[in-house]
Interface confidence: low
C-alpha cells in the first residue's frame, strides 16, 4: 500500500500546534485511503528545506527568497502548490516589484545613480533585494558592505531598518531609519509617501501599492513606472514594466520522488473543507495563535503549479538574477556596453554540430547550448542558460507567452533590401500524391498524416486548427488512422508512422527522420497519405535538388495540393490553394538581450549569410542541405521587424487567435507553465 502521508514541516511551537490541528481535522473528513498529514518540527525554514531534501519531511510553505534557497543544490526542491490571493475567478499568485517615479522627472532605469531613493525596508523583497540585486553590478566598488555601496550610489535614501549610525545616507530622507510604522516612510505605503512628498525621486514598491494609496486615476496618472529596457510606462501596465514578478507564498517539495500529486490532493481537499469561509472549527488560512502559520492568513486558496515549472522558471529570470547577484556578488568583467557572446540554443546532435562550427567561425561571438526539444530551448532562453534561437511561428507564440520577444525574421525571397523588409509570410499547404486521386480536404478521416511537429505552424497549428473547427474535438489521433507528428505521446497513433529508432522515435528533433518540413514530406513519400508542410517543401526536395537516396528521383509533378474548397491543384499553384498564410520563422530572445542579439546576428549574416558563394569550403549560416538546422535552408537573410517587435504584432491577430483556439488541444507543458505566470 503506498504511503499517503504528507509530512508537513513546522518552524515554531505555534506552527506545530496548528499542524496537529490540521492533521486531526483532515482525518475527520478524508476517508482512510486518502491523504493524511504528519507533523515534523524544525528550528527554521532552512532546517525544513534540508529535512525535505533528506526525505525526513515532505512539504513546507516558503516566501520567494527561500524558494530560491530551496532550489539551490544540494536541496534541489521545486515549487508544487501556490497560495493565491484575491478571488477564485481572478486568482493572484504573484506580485510585481516596480520602480515608481513622478511623471515629469525625466530619467530612466540606467540613470538612477545620484538620484534619491525610497525603500520599503532593508532586506525586504520589492523594496530592497530586487532593485539592489538588479542594480548590483552598477554599484560603485567595493560593493561590500552593500549598504555603503548603495549609499554611495544614490545621493540620499530612506531605507528603514538600516543602521543609521554606520550608513547615515540611507536614513537621510527619513530621520531615524525606524523599522516600524512609527516611521512615516516605512513599508510599501511609506516608501510611496516618501516619493509623493518629494523626499525621493524613485520608490521601490509592489504594483498594488500605488492603487492602494491613490484611488483616483487622475492622481495615479501623475506617476510612471521605470522599465528594465530604459523606457517608462503608465502605472497600470505593470505586467509589461516591472523589476521582477515574484511568487507570494509557495509549497515546495523534492524534485524527485517528491509526492507532488499527493501534496496537491491533500491541499485541494483541505481547501474544500477548511478554506475561506468553509468551517468554524478549523481554518486553514487563519492563525489564532500567531500570524501566517503554515500558510498566509490573507491567502484565499491553492493552485497547482504546472509540473514543467522548476524553481528558476517559477521565480523568473529577473528575480533569480537579482538574488544571485546579491548572494554571489559576482559581476562580469566586460564593460556593460559591450555585447557578451550570444548563446545559441541548438536542438540535439545535428544542430549542435552546425552550431559548434558557427561558434568557431564567429571567433567568440556565438556560443552553443544544447537541448533535446524546442520547448527545452525556450525554457533555457527564459532562464538565461541560452540567449536566442530561430523558431517556427507556433513556437514564437509559446516563446511570446513565456515573455520572450522576436528580434529578427527569416526572409525567404531575394530582394534588393532584404534586411529592411520583413515578408508577409509563407503558405501552409497540404500535399498528397497525385496517384491518390480521390483524396480531398473533405475526406481525410482515416488517412495517414505526416506533420513537421506538434505545435509548429504549417505542420500542426494551421491544419489542426482548421480540423478542430470541423470536428470540434482534440482527438486528432482518432481522426487519422495513423501518422507521424513528432512531439506526440509515444503511444499515440500519431507516432506510429515515425521512423526514429528506439528513444528517438517521434522525438521533435532531427534524430527523428520524419521531423521538420523535409521529414514530413519524406513521410508522405514513403508511408503517408497527406503531408502538412510549407509551399517550398516539394520543389526543394524534388527534381534532384535533394541528393538523399529517398529523394533523388522524385518529381514535383507527382504531387498535388489539397484546397480548402475540396478541389486539388498542382504544387506551383500554392498561392490559390493553401490552408493559410504562415508567419515566417523568427529569432527570439529575452528582452534584456534584444539589442545585442540584433547587433551580433546582423554582423554574423554579413559574414556567413547568403553572400557566401562557396559553402563547400566556407561556413554558411543558412545551409544544411535540406535539414533546416538552426535556420531554414531557404533563408535569404534575417530582416528587421520594425514595429512588429512583440509576438502578437509579429504573428498577427489572425494567427494568434487561431493558435489560441487550438490551446484547448495543447499538449505543451511549457505553455501551461508560462500561462500560470501570466494568464
Amino acid at each position: 500500500v503506498p504511503d499517503k502521508t504528507v509530512r508537513w514541516c513546522a518552524v515554531s511551537e505555534h506552527e506545530a500546534t496548528k499542524c496537529q490541528s490540521f492533521r486531526d481535522h483532515m482525518k475527520s473528513v478524508i476517508p482512510s485511503d486518502g491523504p493524511s498529514v504528519a507533523c515534523v518540527k524544525k528550528a527554521s525554514y532552512l532546517d525544513c528545506i534540508r529535512a525535505i531534501a533528506a526525505n525526513e519531511a515532505d512539504a513546507v510553505t516558503l516566501d520567494a527568497g527561500l524558494v530560491y534557497d530551496a532550489y539551490l543544490a544540494p536541496n534541489n526542491l521545486k515549487p508544487v502548490v501556490a497560495e493565491f490571493y484575491g478571488s477564485k475567478e481572478d486568482p493572484q499568485t504573484f506580485y510585481y516589484a516596480v520602480a515608481v517615479v513622478k511623471k515629469d522627472s525625466g530619467f530612466q532605469m540606467n540613470q538612477l545613480r545620484g538620484k534619491k531613493s525610497c525603500h520599503t525596508g532593508l532586506g525586504r523583497s520589492a523594496g530592497w533585494n530586487i532593485p539592489i540585486g538588479l542594480l548590483y553590478c552598477d554599484l560603485p566598488e567595493p560593493r561590500k558592505p552593500l549598504e555603503k555601496a548603495v549609499a554611495n550610489f544614490f545621493s540620499g535614501s530612506c531605507a528603514p531598518c538600516a543602521d543609521g549610525t554606520d550608513f547615515p545616507q540611507l536614513c537621510q530622507l527619513c530621520p531615524g531609519c525606524g523599522c516600524s510604522t512609527l516611521n512615516q516612510y516605512f513599508g510599501y505605503s511609506g516608501a510611496f509617501k516618501c516619493l509623493k512628498d518629494g523626499a525621493g525621486d524613485v520608490a521601490f514598491v509592489k504594483h498594488s501599492t500605488i492603487f492602494e494609496n491613490l484611488a483616483n486615476k487622475a492622481d495615479r496618472d501623475q506617476y510612471e513606472l521605470l522599465c528594465l529596457d530604459n523606457t517608462r510606462k503608465p502605472v497600470d501596465e505593470y505586467k509589461d514594466c516591472h523589476l521582477a514578478q515574484v511568487p507570494s507564498h509557495t509549497v515546495v517539495a523534492r524534485s524527485m520522488g517528491g509526492k507532488e500529486d499527493l501534496i496537491w490532493e491533500l491541499l485541494n481537499q483541505a481547501q474544500e473543507h477548511f478554506g475561506k469561509d468553509k468551517s468554524k472549527e478549523f481554518q486553514l488560512f487563519s492563525s489564532p495563535h500567531g500570524k501566517d502559520l503554515l500558510f498566509k492568513d490573507s491567502a484565499h486558496g491553492f493552485l497547482k503549479v504546472p509540473p514543467r515549472m522548476d524553481a528558476k522558471m517559477y521565480l523568473g529570470y529577473e528575480y533569480v538574477t537579482a538574488i544571485r547577484n546579491l548572494r554571489e556578488g559576482t559581476c562580469p568583467e566586460a564593460p556593460t556596453d559591450e555585447c557578451k557572446p550570444v548563446k545559441w540554443c541548438a536542438l540535439s546532435h545535428h544542430e549542435r554540430l552546425k552550431c559548434d562550427e558557427w561558434s568557431v567561425n564567429s571567433v567568440g561571438k556565438i556560443e552553443c547550448v544544447s537541448a533535446e526539444t524546442t520547448e527545452d530551448c525556450i525554457a533555457k532562453i527564459m532562464n538565461g542558460e541560452a540567449d536566442a534561437m530561430s523558431l517556427d511561428g507556433g513556437f514564437v507564440y509559446i516563446a511570446g507567452k513565456c515573455g520572450l520577444v522576436p528580434v529578427l525574421a527569416e526572409n525567404y525571397n531575394k530582394s534588393d533590401n532584404c534586411e529592411d523588409t520583413p515578408e508577409a509570410g509563407y503558405f501552409a499547404i497540404a500535399v498528397v500524391k497525385k496517384s491518390a486521386s480521390d483524396l480531398t480536404w473533405d475526406n481525410l478521416k482515416g488517412k495517414k498524416s505526416c506533420h513537421t511537429a506538434v505545435g509548429r505552424t504549417a505542420g500542426w497549428n494551421i491544419p489542426m486548427g482548421l480540423l478542430y473547427n470541423k470536428i470540434n474535438h482534440c482527438r486528432f489521433d482518432e481522426f487519422f488512422s495513423e501518422g507521424c507528428a513528432p512531439g506526440s505521446k509515444k503511444d499515440s497513433s500519431l507516432c506510429k508512422l515515425c521512423m526514429g529508432s528506439g528513444l528517438n522515435l517521434c522525438e521533435p528533433n532531427n534524430k527523428e527522420g520524419y521531423y521538420g518540413y523535409t521529414g514530413a514530406f519524406r513521410c508522405l513519400v514513403e508511408k503517408g497519405d497527406v503531408a502538412f508542410v510549407k509551399h517550398q517543401t516539394v520543389p526543394q526536395n524534388t527534381g534532384g535538388k535533394n541528393p538523399d537516396p529517398w529523394a533523388k528521383n522524385l518529381n514535383e509533378k507527382d504531387y498535388e495540393l489539397l484546397c480548402l474548397d475540396g478541389t486539388r491543384k498542382p504544387v506551383e499553384e500554392y498561392a490559390n490553394c493553401h490552408l493559410a498564410r504562415a508567419p515566417n520563422h523568427a529569432v527570439v530572445t529575452r528582452k534584456d538581450k534584444e539589442a545585442c542579439v540584433h547587433k551580433i546576428l546582423r554582423q554574423q549574416q554579413h559574414l556567413f549569410g547568403s553572400n557566401v558563394t562557396d559553402c563547400s569550403g566556407n561556413f554558411c549560416l543558412f545551409r544544411s542541405e535540406t535539414k533546416d538546422l538552426l535556420f531554414r535552408d531557404d533563408t535569404v537573410c534575417l530582416a528587421k521587424l520594425h514595429d512588429r517587435n512583440t509576438y502578437e504584432k509579429y504573428l498577427g491577430e489572425e494567427y494568434v487567435k487561431a493558435v489560441g483556439n487550438l490551446r484547448k488541444c495543447s499538449t505543451s507543458s511549457l505553455l501551461e507553465a508560462c500561462t500560470f505566470r501570466r494568464p
Epitope: 546532435h349 545535428h350 554540430l353 562550427e357 529508432s501 532531427n510 534524430k511 527523428e512 527522420g513 521531423y515 521529414g519 541528393p547 538523399d548 537516396p549 529517398w550 559553402c615 563547400s616 569550403g617 566556407n618 544544411s624 542541405e625 535540406t626 535539414k627
Partner: nanobody, 122 residues
Framework: QVKLEESGGGLVQPGGSLRLSCAAS????????MGWYRQAPGKEREVVVG???????NYADSVKGRFTISRDNAKNTVSLQMNSLKPEDTAVYYC????????????????WGQGTQVTVSS
C-alpha cells in the same frame, strides 16, 4: 559512409606535447572539412579546430598558439600537434569530418571517430 580512426592519445605532463592523427576511409571524396572536437567529463562538447579542403582553419581561443592542425588531402588524414599542454586540455578528443553530400538523418553529414583520451597530469 565515412569512417574515421584516431590514434596518438595518452598521458602527458603539463607543458608537454602530443600528436593526434586521424585517418578517413570510405566515401572520402565527399569530405569538405576535417577537424577535432573534445569533451571533458561533465562538460559540453567543444570544437578545438576545423580545417576546410581549401586550408582555412579556425581554432578555439583556448588552444590558439599551442595547437596546430595539418591535413594531407591525398592520404585523407588530419593531424593535431598539441604543444604546451595544460591540465584543462584533458578530454576525449574526437576527429570529425564534414561532408558536402548531405545524406539522410540516419547517415549524418558529420562523421566522427571513437575518440582518443588525452590526459595532462603530473
Amino acid at each position: 559512409q565515412v569512417k574515421l580512426e584516431e590514434s596518438g592519445g595518452g598521458l602527458v605532463q603539463p607543458g608537454g606535447s602530443l600528436r593526434l592523427s586521424c585517418a578517413a576511409s570510405g566515401n572520402v571524396f565527399t569530405i569538405d572539412a576535417m577537424g577535432w572536437y573534445r569533451q571533458a567529463p561533465g562538460k559540453e562538447r567543444e570544437v578545438v579546430v576545423g580545417m576546410t579542403n581549401g586550408g582555412k582553419t579556425n581554432y578555439a581561443d583556448s588552444v590558439k598558439g599551442r595547437f596546430t592542425i595539418s591535413r594531407d588531402n591525398a592520404k585523407n588524414t588530419v593531424s593535431l600537434q598539441m604543444n604546451s599542454l595544460k591540465p584543462e586540455d584533458t578530454a576525449v578528443y574526437y576527429c570529425y569530418a564534414r561532408s558536402k553530400l548531405i545524406a539522410t538523418i540516419n547517415n549524418p553529414y558529420d562523421y566522427w571517430g571513437q575518440g582518443t583520451q588525452v590526459t595532462v597530469s603530473s
